[in-house]
């Protein structure tokens, strides 16, 4: 018996508006009805929780109102979007999936998505 497998893309480039999206897919060993998804950021030997959501299979993924994350779920796949990113937010974003109910509990952690964020150059003043 091994840890639950979680797959996510190796690299994602955030848009010029500071938005990055990626898919987090997990291989569920059972028929979970309640799943918790957490996005963690590892950078400079620090680990921080970016956002987290618990959802019932078949229902919408709901993050807190002030969360920088949004997402949708489809089967064993979660489509995550992180907004408001700046260059200083570049780092490894890790998808953590926990099958909460029914028992048994399972935990899976992806290998991380390196998100690169490049702050847009300010537009030069124009006389036109």
């Amino acid at each position: 018996c091994k840890a639950m497998h979680v797959a996510q893309p190796a690299v994602v480039l955030a848009s010029s508006r500071g938005i990055a999206s990626f898919v987090c897919e997990y291989a569920s060993p059972g028929k979970a009805t309640e799943v918790r998804v957490t996005v963690l950021r590892q950078a400079d030997s620090q680990v921080t929780e970016v956002c987290a959501a618990t959802y019932m299979m078949g229902n919408e993924l709901t993050f807190l109102d002030d969360s920088i994350c949004t997402g949708t779920s489809s089967g064993n796949q979660v489509n995550l979007t992180i907004q408001g990113l700046r260059a200083m937010d570049t780092g490894l974003y890790i998808c953590k999936v926990e099958l909460m109910y029914p028992p048994p509990y399972y935990l899976g952690i992806g290998n991380g998505t390196q998100i690169y964020v490049i702050d847009p150059e300010p537009c030069p003043d124009s006389d036109f």
Epitope: A3, V47, I94, P104, L107, I109, N111
Partner: nanobody
Framework: EVQLVESGGGLVQPGGSLRLSCAAS????????IGWFRQAPGKGRETVAC??????SYADSVKGRFTISRDNAKNMVYLQMNSLRAEDTAVYYC??????????????????????WTQGTQVTVSS
């Protein structure tokens, strides 16, 4: 799936020793990092130590006093606690995390990466 059960807590005098055990069932320990964490009354859960196949890592507050070890054949992880102090009084938890290539010595013990938490065992250091 992994199931963890810890044991070995109790009351000990300052300067004394205690050994905590964490037994795993349902899976081999090999693909996991096993960590010990503690929570004192009114405080958050903090890292004590963790161990994977080849590395160990300790919180600064326990370095030189606590030793973590694992016996894969018995599916056991141990925390040997020596020179105990009053500030070591807490509920101690064992937890597991899938071992990942991006873990560093500084991050492999981070509580965010862990699951399969045990119920906790009370360690009280008092005279």
């Amino acid at each position: 799936e992994v199931q963890l059960v810890e044991s070995g807590g109790g009351l000990v005098q300052p300067g004394g020793s205690l050994r905590l055990s964490c037994a795993a069932s349902g899976s081999t320990l090999d693909p996991f990092v096993i960590g010990w964490f503690r929570q004192a009354p009114g405080k958050g859960r903090e890292t004590v130590a963790c161990i994977n196949r080849s590395r160990t890592s300790y919180a600064d507050s326990v370095k030189g006093r606590f030793t973590i070890s694992r016996d894969n054949a018995k599916n056991m992880v141990y925390l040997q606690m020596n020179s105990l102090r009053a500030e070591d009084t807490a509920v101690y938890y064992c937890a597991a995390s899938p071992d990942k290539p991006f873990y560093t010595d500084q991050t492999m013990c981070n509580k965010h990466y862990y699951g399969y938490w045990t119920q906790g065992t009370q360690v009280t250091v008092s005279s």
